[in-house]
């Protein structure tokens, strides 16, 4: 019995087609992805093949102005229109709190939303009961398939799930649910979830009875043969894991941002054993036309976004200096504002011993593309922020050793004075440079804000200690020459859309007046 699994993950609000790098579409003839194009391909496969499931492995939320404005209603509407069969909860589905998940998505979705390792307690338990499920048995042709969901247990550090949701260990939570499916005579089981490729592989290895793992969170690109675009494969598609009980379990993921549609064909025998698995992600490029009815619907929803861009978010009573003459040479108050917003967006009081789990921010000065003049009545709009942060990136959470941070700050000034973009703006860090010294030895003082303290204060950076840092995804991926970050990071979790982080902060503060205050000397 042959099953076709179509899958997406980490779409992050890319409802409209995007450029090849998943930023805003400029030249339509070269654009990719988007729900209208996705629907065309999905329908084509549904017509051609008998047993098809369309699955999403989480993180539909967060990433463009679509989410900022529609807050998840757009996800429910367009996933319903595409007739998704199931979705796993990702960490970003909690970005607007539990209410921001329940009302727009859980109550509106016409497909099951799954996670076996999230347990509700207290008053939330009855409120959320039945709105998401640990598993769902889906009829597919003559057969039935069990889908069991899972979500990163790091979600409390990455998003805002509140205090009434407990995130359990994925493997511990999945096994009893899979066992339950087996007792219901369901012998074809897909684990669909959002914990990253390493955990996907562990689930394939450790959870008895799981036949296929469809994952997300790590934006992993897998491909067999010559890849069709710029993404470099982390392995073959599907990636085969040998389970502890000796079965070959295919593991798949489909990069991110709706650029690809994962396409996996599985042949099962009567016992539910995977006899064969093959496929590849399908690049959703302009050779696939956008479905006209979905496209018309997108255009209708688009109108509200254009109106939103020009509305006031808050006010500034000082000039926000985002000029390259400042931000690439010295501390600039636009850099301070953005870093403060980045830390504020990551306030998670999950442990009494820590005032927060992260205190540090770094930001490449070259990523700040425009100032904002306060003489326009102080008004700040989304449009203004889009000029400052035009690249559509995210502000991510990484874990780095002190020694890596030291290298990063040396790199920041290794060719100081040439107006290059790698000069770092900071938050929760005091750095002192001596530019008379030779490159690679210019950082003379590097103090960082403590987290395990009730009164935050600055302590010298320890080379062997592991620190959490918020930074742009551009830096996490080694951009502007920060190869040491990419090579040496110990953990990387993608965060919220850059403009959204700053806009939320400005809306929260109402009036802002960031200063240059001696963070960089």
């Amino acid at each position: 019995w042959e099953l076709t699994i179509l899958h997406t993950n980490d779409v992050h609000s890319r409802l409209e087609q995007t450029s090849e790098d998943s930023s805003k579409c400029v030249n339509a003839s070269r654009c990719m992805g988007g729900v209208a194009r996705l629907f065309t391909k999905v329908q084509q496969i549904r017509r051609a093949e008998p047993n098809v499931l369309l699955l999403d492995a989480g993180d539909q939320y967060q990433g463009t102005i679509w989410f900022t404005v529609y807050k998840g209603a757009e996800v429910a509407h367009f996933m319903n229109a595409l007739r998704y069969d199931a979705m796993a909860l990702g960490n970003h589905e909690f970005d607007n709190g539990v209410e921001g998940l329940i009302e727009p998505l859980l109550k509106e979705a016409k497909f099951p939303i799954l996670s076996a390792n999230i347990k509700a307690k207290g008053p939330l338990a009855s409120q959320i009961s039945g709105l998401y499920l640990p598993y769902k048995v889906l009829p597919v042709g003559d057969e039935v398939v069990g889908i069991v969901g899972y979500t990163s247990k790091e979600t409390p550090f990455l998003s805002n799930p509140g205090t009434n949701l407990v995130f359990e260990d994925e493997i511990t939570a999945l096994q009893p649910e899979v066992d339950k499916l087996k007792t219901l005579n369901v012998n074809k089981i897909i684990a669909l979830g959002h914990s990253g490729f390493e955990m996907d592989k562990l689930i394939a290895q450790k959870v008895r009875g799981v036949d296929v793992v469809v994952g997300g969170h790590s934006n992993t690109f897998l491909y067999t043969g010559n890849p069709p675009s710029k993404e470099v494969p982390a392995g073959k598609y599907p990636f085969i894991v040998t389970s502890d009980d000796g079965r070959k379990v295919p593991v798949v993921q489909a990069y991110a941002f709706g650029k690809y549609l994962g396409y996996l064909k599985i042949e099962f025998d009567e016992r539910g054993n995977v006899i064969s698995s093959h496929g590849n992600p399908i690049l959703l490029n302009s050779s696939i036309p956008e479905d006209p009815s979905i496209k018309a619907d997108i255009n209708k929803w688009r109108i509200k976004l254009d109106n939103y861009s020009t509305q006031e978010l808050g006010k500034t009573i000082v000039y926000l200096d985002g000029s390259s003459q400042s931000c690439r040479f010295r501390e600039c108050n636009m850099g301070n504002l953005i870093c403060d917003a980045m830390i504020n967006n990551n306030l998670r009081h999950t442990d009494e011993m820590f005032w927060n789990h992260v205190s540090m921010c770094i930001l490449n000065g070259g990523g700040i593309r425009s100032p904002i003049d306060e003489r326009n009545n102080g008004t700040i709009t989304w449009e203004n922020l889009a000029a400052v942060l035009p690249f559509g990136g995210t502000f991510d959470l990484v874990q780095l050793k002190g020694s890596t941070l030291k290298k990063a700050f040396e790199h920041s000034v290794h060719r100081y004075g040439q107006s290059t973009g790698e000069f770092l703006q900071v938050g929760g860090i005091h750095v002192v440079y001596d530019l008379s010294r030779k490159p690679g030895d210019r950082v003379v003082k590097l103090d960082v804000l403590c987290t395990k303290c009730r009164v935050p204060s600055y302590d010298p950076l320890k080379m062997d200690e592991v620190y959490k840092v918020i930074l742009p995804n551009f830096l996490a991926n080694g951009g502007d020459g920060f190869q040491m970050i990419k090579d040496e990071l110990l953990r990387h979790d993608s965060g919220d859309q850059d403009i959204n982080v700053v806009s939320t902060y400005i809306s929260k503060m109402k009036v802002i007046y960031p200063a240059v205050e001696g963070r960089i000397k």
Epitope: W1, D142, E143, T242, G246, D269, E270, N273, I275, S276
Partner: antibody, heavy 114, light 107 residues
Framework: EVQLVQSGAEVKKPGASVKVSCKAS????????MNWVMQAPGQGLEWIGR????????FYSQKFKGRATLTVDKSTSTVYMELSSLRSEDTAVYYC???????WGQGTTVTVSS | DIQMTQSPSSLSASVGDRVTITCRAS??????LNWLQQKPGKAPKRLIY???SLDSGVPSRFSGSGSGTEYTLTISSLQPEDFATYYC?????????FGGGTKVEIK
């Protein structure tokens, strides 16, 4: 649990035909195939052919094409193998086996003797 | 048709021995290969499917490996109940074909 139950032993004369049945249970019958395999006394296994339960599509080994006929009765989840123009070398145990031979019937002994 | 050449056709071994059986296909069969065990007077039983996946209930001393045209069944430590005849089966293309079998006997 998958179960395949075959009909009993048969003794046939050369030139006659035999029809062996295989009743399946414990799985969604219409979604799969059934294989038939022959094993002559003291010999190895030989694949005869397969039938798709849902639409009756068949595929035969060249050796058995024209003499073996596979049919299906969806209402009773039963598959049949008829072998015609029997000769002494057709004396064997005939097995039905699921799609990828994960489960087997108990075997039906067919003896061809004058 | 794809020919499956199985070797050896028989072998004698003692309890605890490591036993290796090989199947060579006349052309590339991907990993579309099963290993079966048959005891006298009984129907065959599948041990391994898709080259290396172990059927449920099959002891972990059995393992399969290979790719392309060369495939191996290994019994890491032979047990008394393992004395039987073993067959490979390719299902890469019709007609499916079995190897000639390997009879594992007590030394």
């Amino acid at each position: 649990e998958v179960q395949l139950v075959q009909s009993g032993a048969e003794v046939k004369k050369p030139g006659a035909s035999v029809k062996v049945s295989c009743k399946a249970s414990g799985y969604t019958f219409t979604a799969y195939f059934m294989n038939w395999v022959m094993q002559a006394p003291g010999q190895g296994l030989e694949w005869i052919g397969r039938i798709y339960h849902n639409n009756g599509d068949t595929f035969y080994s060249q050796k058995f094409k024209g003499r073996a006929t596979l049919t299906v009765d969806k209402s009773t989840s039963t598959v049949y193998m008829e072998l015609s123009s029997l000769r002494s070398e057709d004396t064997a145990v005939y097995y039905c086996a699921t799609s990828y031979v994960g489960d087997w019937g108990q075997g039906t002994t067919v003896t061809v003797s004058s | 048709d794809i020919q499956m050449t199985q070797s050896p056709s028989s072998l004698s071994a003692s309890v605890g021995d490591r036993v290796t059986i090989t199947c060579r296909a006349s052309q590339d069969i991907g990993d579309s290969l099963n290993w079966l065990q048959q005891k006298p007077g009984k129907a065959p039983k599948r041990l391994i499917y898709a080259t290396s996946s172990l059927d449920s209930g099959v002891p972990s001393r059995f393992s399969g490996s290979g790719s392309g045209t060369e495939y191996t069944l290994t019994i890491s430590s032979l047990q008394p109940e393992d004395f039987a005849t073993y067959y490979c089966l390719q299902y890469a293309s019709f007609p499916w074909t079995f190897g000639g079998g390997t009879k594992v006997e007590i030394k």
